[in-house]
């Protein structure tokens, strides 16, 4: 960076090099150039010469003042106009940053996705800090009192093999950056209570032309969990509101769910499951579209495939433009 340049003097910042966004700051430049009594001292921000709020303090030093500085990062350097020198002489440079201290991490959630071999912990980091912010996830066994710490920049995957202290743990998150540190509340977990079954997937749909046409949705999961509760939600793509059906499911075979739908309408379906009685749900599955026929039977297999973690984002980009914000891929 700019801090690695050879300096003929120095540059410093008041109150500090990294500071809270919106503060008033002063940048000082002091020349120490052999055989040069600077005629003028210049400041540059991101390569652009500053023309205002510069004060000459003495023969070798000048100060640049910014009110309400709002840029997350800036490269500053200063130069001197020396007599008998054709070009400005570089004095020194410094990278400065502004941002915010971290918020208290909240909504700490830890889940084990079946077959993943990991416990995944996430949290709401709060407002954007603009500066490098690190998180330390503390995992303390309630049985052995042993505590492990994991450093990360966002979420964390902890191998379940490393959780040797029994089944019960306390988890909390510390957030820290150059402007401050905050700590979340402690979350108590039991490893058996946080398992999320293997993803449920809708594979196909068919409409049977009976007296009252009915649509059958075929869906499945590779889970080995015996007691699983699921929800399937569906709606016409032109609607805002979802209809939800609940199922107690045994995945020893492919599930078939029946719906009585309006003819000649495009519907969208999603499914999610949880271990019965437990806290966390799967994210909603990929969007599955099925258009009911006017009268003739029809079989479709048109799933809008994408990473289920991102179902919230994908929904927002679907061309119908009518899907509601209720479509977040959350696990709560």
């Amino acid at each position: 960076g700019i801090t690695n340049i050879n300096c003929s003097g120095h540059i410093w910042v008041e109150p500090a090099t990294i500071f809270k966004m919106g503060m008033n700051i002063s940048i000082y430049c002091q020349a120490a150039i052999k055989n040069c009594q600077p005629r003028k001292l210049h400041f540059y921000k991101n390569g652009i010469k500053e023309r205002f709020q510069i004060t000459r303090i003495n023969k070798t030093t000048a100060r640049l003042w910014y009110k309400n500085f709002l840029e997350p990062h800036a490269s500053m350097y200063c130069t001197a106009e020396c007599p008998k020198h054709f070009q400005e002489t570089l004095i020194c440079g410094k990278d400065i940053s502004s941002g915010y201290p971290p918020d208290i991490p909240d909504e700490v959630t830890c889940v084990i996705y079946e077959y993943s071999g990991n416990m995944t912990c996430t949290w709401n980091a709060g407002k954007l800090t603009y500066i490098d912010t690190k998180y330390v996830v503390h995992v303390k066994s309630l049985e052995t009192e042993e505590e492990q710490q994991y450093l990360t920049s966002s979420y964390i995957n902890i191998s379940t093999d490393s959780l040797q202290g029994g089944k019960k743990y306390l988890v909390w998150v510390q957030a820290a950056n150059a402007l401050g540190m905050e700590e979340s509340k402690q979350l108590q977990i039991h490893l058996d209570d946080i398992v999320i079954p293997s993803a449920a997937v809708i594979s196909r749909a068919e409409t049977i032309n009976a007296t009252v046409p009915k649509t059958i949705i075929y869906w499945d999961s590779q889970t080995t969990i015996e007691k699983v509760s699921c929800e399937m939600r569906y709606k016409a793509t032109t609607n805002q509101t979802w209809n939800v059906k609940e199922f107690d499911t045994n995945f020893t075979y492919v599930q078939q769910s029946e719906f009585y739908l309006e003819p000649n309408i495009k519907y969208v379906f999603q499914v999610r499951c949880q271990e019965t009685g437990k806290r966390y749900w799967q994210p909603w599955s990929s969007l599955f579209f099925h258009k009911t026929p006017e009268t003739v039977p029809q079989v479709t297999s048109k799933a809008f495939q994408h990473d289920t973690w991102n179902s919230g984002l994908t929904v927002a980009s679907i061309s119908t433009g009518h899907l509601t914000s209720d479509n977040r891929g959350d696990i709560g």
Epitope: W12, A16, T55, W65, D132
Partner: antibody, heavy 117, light 107 residues
């Protein structure tokens, strides 16, 4: 030559306030930041806060926020540090220091504040 | 707050010895590190700024190095007047913080 001359030692009762002054001479007072740093007996150095006299706005360490007020009077080239709700742990030598380089290159001689009932 | 940790907290050395004091920041502070010398009953004195720049009037036996999180103050040949306590300090973020100090004593 820049000099920072501080006010004399003080003995204060718990719960009271103290105001320490720091008079600058021999340099441009208003343009450089003045900080206050304290040192409890046998302990290390602790930054309390600082001010650039020409701007008048001070920055404080969170630990002292609400209890310390740093001000400056350009007309007399004097900076002040007032600490309120004194307790015995505030017994320390209080230094003013000027930052006319990347480090604190000029220091006052220190003012001993003793908090005792 | 950025924590500054010095080691050792004290050391015994003889005149002429080479002395090294280290300072570690709890997070990267680029080269924003200053070193001070303090003698009993006196105010601190700036020795090194920007991790490695020697303050005017300070003997050349003092030198500083490092950047990021790890820094070193070296006295190449200890003199009788160098027995004192040494502090590192970061001006990178508020609150400006000091190390706990390293006392250099006569062996």
């Amino acid at each position: 030559q820049v000099q920072l001359v501080q006010s004399g030692a003080e003995v204060k009762k718990p719960g009271s306030s103290v105001k320490v002054s720091c008079k600058a001479s021999g340099g441009t007072f208003s343009s450089y930041a003045i900080s206050w740093v304290r040192q409890a007996p046998g302990q290390g150095l602790e930054w309390m806060g600082g001010i650039i006299p020409i701007f008048g706005t001070a920055n404080y360490a969170q630990k002292f926020q609400g209890r310390v007020t740093i001000t400056a009077d350009e007309s007399t080239s004097t900076a002040y540090m007032e600490l309120s709700s004194l307790r015995s742990e505030d017994t320390a030598v209080y230094y003013c220091a000027r930052r006319s380089s990347p480090g604190f290159d000029y220091w006052g001689q220190g003012t001993l504040v003793t908090v005792s009932s | 707050d950025i924590q500054m940790t010095q080691s050792p907290s004290s050391l015994s050395a003889s005149v002429g010895d080479r002395v090294t004091i280290t300072c570690r920041a709890s997070q990267s502070i680029d080269n924003d590190l200053n070193w001070y010398q303090q003698k009993p009953g006196k105010a601190p004195k700036l020795l090194i700024y920007n991790a490695s720049s020697l303050q005017s009037g300070v003997p050349s036996r003092f030198s500083g190095s490092g950047s990021g999180t790890d820094f070193t103050l070296t006295i190449s040949s200890l003199q009788p007047e160098d027995f004192a306590t040494y502090y590192c300090q970061q001006p990178y973020s508020i609150p400006l913080t000091f190390g706990q100090g390293t006392k250099v004593e006569i062996k």
